[in-house]
Interface confidence: low
């Protein structure tokens, strides 16, 4: 099922470019904030911490100078920049920060930020928008199970990180729906959700609700999918 | 120098059962912590629990240590194991100066944990293939065991993909494979399960329209997104 | 459907209490933040206060800092404008809003930085009158 | 605190008619700006958000602009349902401040 806030933050970036990430902790009496990079299959690693009183980064050893700077846009609120992108440094940023909730030091992390560096030679389309293909219900799956299944495929968007959910119309209920892994397709991805819903909802119109970083306007898609008229239906006496 | 190895990169374990995560690691301090993380999918990075190497194993809720601190041991327990607990769980050590607050912490690579259903009665799935254009579904429902084959029938393959497998609301499994085929509309499914085959054919019906459910007259099947 | 409902206003006098209610629906204020503006009779909009239910963030503008207090209730869905000390140039309609979430910056960066108003209650006149 | 001097405060126009109106920021807000119409007794409506970006729904005639720190609300040709007070507003900093407002009435 889906959950519309559990999506990680992303940001995508050209080699050579900058990035920002913004440190998302609540606290505001911290002295130390730190940096963290989990790249798939390795281990999360710190990069450096920055000392809130004296505004000054600390980076561990064998990072360059200069590629990594936190700033403070206002009081308690830090932002970690960093210069002269590589495609290596894609991966999930953390800040992080220790905390004494109860009465016991942990060390507490943000919700991480997900940060894509391609090379400008990737030859991605101007439109990297999730593409809908919407499936209605098969006339045998609505006539033998009493249920219809809808599935909303999107291709060829990029980058992968989308939140898909399903919505009647007319009602801001988020459904219970499945859903793949996002998978790569050349250089984009493609990604399909399915919901299943009882027979006395195909007659209610469906939305399969997609939000992407790169949807035009900045706005979520919705796929309509149309109401199901199923009585025009007759079984062949062999599938009783 | 200081290190952490978590050898199992994944793990697999029924529902309700308990499923232990190794880690081991090396330093040269005397005094220090080793922390649990749990990493969702959204790559949210959760504290689970602490365990001093100076204290007795730590215990909270369903989370227990058994800590060996001469063999560098530290084992996660998460006991009545729930689906909710798939996940990627990180161990960490931590630097002793915690004073200071400028301390890192050393992570292992972690290790994946995949909560499985409940064991349940062997059930054959239904069969249902999806059209629109050139793009073919299979969907398959409502299955147990997990073990499963999906293939789609046709000549004039274009493209497939791997299939979805996920747990159903009913503690089963539901699957969906897709594909684009040039003669879309002669591809059929054939699913080989608990070493039987299942033929989307065994489910059609016979029907005054075409493949699909009709849309109602007045709807536009060809629907546009809105954006 | 998103609606912002507000209540909670009425005649009081200077010194006096009031507690302002901003019932949301279509969303979850937990998930969301949740602002108030003022507006007095014959003038333009003044920024009150915001909430960050989830990060328990909230920020006043100086003329109330220190007076009133903005919660919410993300049981009952519902953000609320404690007033105190109250004075006469607190008369105002007083509006509920909700920013807008669009990509990339409030919903990716969490932040306040980016975040116009586009839903609105329909106001409540409070009136601080001896 | 961010000052967000509008103006005019007020101008005569006809239905037709190109209107402008200004908004000058008293430091950097990046395109943290964003236009409001407000009609009497009604809350105020989003038209233009991040300085250039047209709000779902609202006509095309409306556009937003920036250049450094001035911020601009165009409406192409004046339609009757436009009379009404517009206001500005900077939020890419608390405070969040608005402008003085432009009321537009009809010539």
């Known amino acids: 099922s889906s959950n519309l806030e559990g999506r990680t933050k992303s940001v995508t970036r050209q080699t050579g470019s900058s990035a920002e990430i913004t440190c998302d902790l609540t606290v505001t009496n911290t002295f130390y904030i730190h940096w963290y990079l989990h790249q798939e299959g390795k281990a999360p690693q710190r990069l450096l911490y920055y000392d809130v009183s004296t505004a000054r980064d600390v980076l561990e050893s064998g990072l360059s100078p200069g590629k990594y700077y936190t700033h403070t846009p206002r009081r308690w609120s830090w932002i970690l920049r960093l210069q002269n992108l590589i495609e290596n440094d894609s991966g999930v940023y953390y800040c992080a920060t220790w905390d004494r909730p109860l009465n016991a030091w942990i060390k507490t992390f943000a919700k991480g930020t997900r940060l894509i560096v391609t090379s400008p030679d990737k030859q991605l389309d101007a439109d990297v928008s999730p593409k809908p293909t919407i499936f209605l219900p098969s006339i045998a799956e609505t006539k033998l199970q009493k249920a219809g299944t809808y599935l909303c495929l999107l291709e060829k968007f990029f980058p992968d990180v989308i939140k898909i959910h399903w919505q009647e119309k007319k009602s801001n209920t988020i459904l219970g729906s499945q859903e793949g892994n996002t998978m790569k397709t050349n250089d984009t991805y493609m990604k399909f959700s399915w919901l299943t819903v009882p027979e006395k909802s195909l007659d209610k119109e469906h939305r399969c609700i997609v939000r992407h970083e790169n949807n035009k306007n900045g706005v979520d898609q919705e796929i309509i999918f149309p109401p199901i008229k199923t009585d025009v239906i007759t079984m062949d006496p062999k599938d009783n | 120098a200081q290190k952490v190895t978590q050898a199992q990169s994944s793990v697999s374990m029924p529902v309700r059962k308990a499923v232990t995560l190794n880690c081991l690691y090396e330093t040269s301090w005397w005094s220090y912590y080793i922390f649990w993380y749990k990493q969702l999918p959204s790559k949210e990075m959760i504290f689970l629990i602490r365990q001093g190497s100076d204290e007795q194993n730590a215990k909270s809720g369903r989370y227990s240590v058994n800590f060996k601190k001469a063999a560098k041991s530290v084992a996660l327990t998460i006991s009545a194991l729930q689906l909710e607990d798939s996940a990627k769980y990180f161990c960490a050590l931590g630097e002793p100066n915690h004073f200071l607050n400028t301390d890192k912490l050393i992570f292992g690579k972690g290790t994946r944990v995949t909560v499985e259903p409940r064991s349940q009665p062997h059930t054959k799935p239904s069969v249902f293939v999806m059209k629109n254009g050139t793009n073919v579904a299979c969907l398959v429902k409502e299955f147990y065991p997990k073990d499963i084959r999906i293939n789609l029938v046709s000549s004039k393959k274009i493209t497939e993909f791997d299939p979805a497998i996920v747990i159903s609301p009913s503690g089963k499994y539901n699957a969906v494979k897709l594909g684009k085929y040039e003669d879309s509309n002669s591809v059929t499914c054939s699913v080989q399960h608990d070493n039987k085959t299942v033929h989307s054919t065994d489910f059609e019906v016979k029907t005054d329209s075409t493949d699909h459910v009709k849309p109602k007259e007045t709807e536009n099947t060809k629907q546009p997104s809105k954006s | 459907e998103v609606q912002l409902v507000e209540s909670g206003g009425g005649l009081v006098q200077p010194g006096g209490s009031l507690r302002l209610s901003c019932a949301a629906s279509g969303f979850t204020v937990s998930s969301s933040s949740i602002h108030w503006v003022r507006q007095a009779p014959g003038k333009g909009l003044e920024w009150v206060a915001s909430?960050?239910?989830?990060?328990?963030?909230?920020y006043y503008a100086d003329s109330v800092k220190g007076r009133f207090t903005i919660s919410a209730d993300t049981s009952k869905n519902t953000a609320y404008l404690q007033m105190n000390s109250l004075r006469a140039e607190d008369t105002a309609v007083y509006y509920c809003a909700r920013p807008y979430y669009w990509y990339p910056y409030y919903y990716w960066s969490g932040g306040w930085e980016y975040a116009a108003f586009d839903y609105w209650g329909q106001g409540t006149l409070v009136t601080v009158s001896s | 605190d961010i000052q967000m001097t509008q103006s005019p405060s007020s101008l005569s126009a006809s239905v037709g008619d190109r209107v402008t109106i200004t908004c000058r920021a008293s430091?950097?807000?990046?395109?943290?700006v964003a236009w409001y119409q407000q009609k009497p007794g009604k809350a105020p409506k989003l038209l233009i958000y991040?300085?250039?970006s047209l709000y779902s729904g609202v006509p095309s005639r409306f556009s937003g602009s920036r250049s450094g720190t001035d911020f601009t609300l165009t409406i192409s040709s004046l339609q009757p349902e436009d009379f009404a007070t517009y206001y500005c507003q900077q939020y890419g900093e608390y405070p969040i401040t608005f402008g003085q407002g432009t009321k537009v009435e009809i010539k």
């Open positions: 991040s300085a250039s």
């Open positions: 909430i960050y239910s989830s990060s328990g963030y909230t």
């Open positions: 430091q950097s807000v990046s395109s943290a």
